[in-house]
């Protein structure tokens, strides 16, 4: 039997201060550029080394950004989301969904990812 992949989903509020080169990450997604099937949400595709997000340390590649400064990112065109981030000001509050993959093996067996095997 194969192990089952589950996800632990958590949300976090992350406050970033815009750095010399902006917020320091890349985004994908939107109603016209779906990154995840049947989900037009906005996702973090890259964290820039030594950028604002990397120095803060909490935002991760693959995170879904739910809102920016309280403004919901649902059902936005990709460019509209980009513009929202770029115009968000110096202090930026992000509501973020982290999705941590958890490997569960069949009952009575260790999962494939268990290093103790």
């Amino acid at each position: 039997m194969n192990g089952r992949v589950d996800y632990l989903v958590t949300e976090e509020e992350i406050n970033l201060t815009r750095g010399p080169s902006g917020l320091g990450f890349n985004i994908v997604g939107g109603t016209d550029q779906q990154y995840v099937s049947n989900d037009s949400g906005i996702y973090v595709s890259r964290i820039k080394e030594n950028g604002a997000a990397a120095l803060d340390g909490r935002l991760q590649e693959g995170d879904k950004i739910l809102s920016v400064n309280g403004q919901d990112l649902k059902n936005l065109l990709h460019q509209d989301a980009v513009d929202l981030f770029r115009n968000a000001g110096y202090a930026v509050s992000l509501r973020v969904q982290h999705r941590l993959q958890v490997q569960n093996g069949p009952i009575g067996h260790r999962g494939e990812g268990d290093p103790s095997g």
Epitope: G22, N26, V28, Q33, S45, H78, V82, R86
Partner: nanobody, 125 residues
């Protein structure tokens, strides 16, 4: 495996045109910001042009504005650089580069890009 393969370089005379192409594989191309950089002998790698995921937004180095045009074809996973009115100072190795998503921190620094081609030589005499 991600691959960016440039083609179209060569030796031309001042005032001539060249069209460089970059074929991408191993990535979901439509999610990627793509760019061209160039590096002359003994110099740093310089930004030339960038294009967003859909092709609707482009940005150029001042030195090539009005002469070079970047475009992309998401159906064919290619990005092209049309270079007109070439000058001897355009002589360099030209590199195609890509990064997933749209940057919120700038797109003119080589460090903003994750994937690179091997380069194609352009010489203008």
């Amino acid at each position: 495996e991600v691959q960016l393969v440039e083609s179209g370089g060569g030796l031309v005379q001042a005032g001539d045109s060249l069209r460089l192409s970059c074929a991408a594989s191993g990535i979901t191309f439509r999610w990627y910001t793509m760019a061209w950089f160039r590096q002359a002998p003994g110099k740093e790698r310089d930004f030339v042009a960038t294009i967003n995921w859909s092709g609707s937004d482009t940005n150029y180095a001042d030195s090539v504005k009005g002469r070079f045009t970047i475009s992309r074809d998401n159906a064919k996973n290619t990005v092209t650089l049309q270079m007109n009115s070439l000058q001897p100072e355009d002589t360099a190795v030209y590199y195609c580069a890509g990064v997933p998503g749209t940057s919120l921190s700038g797109e003119t620094d080589p460090r903003d890009y994750d994937y690179w081609g091997q380069g194609t030589q352009v010489t203008v005499s």
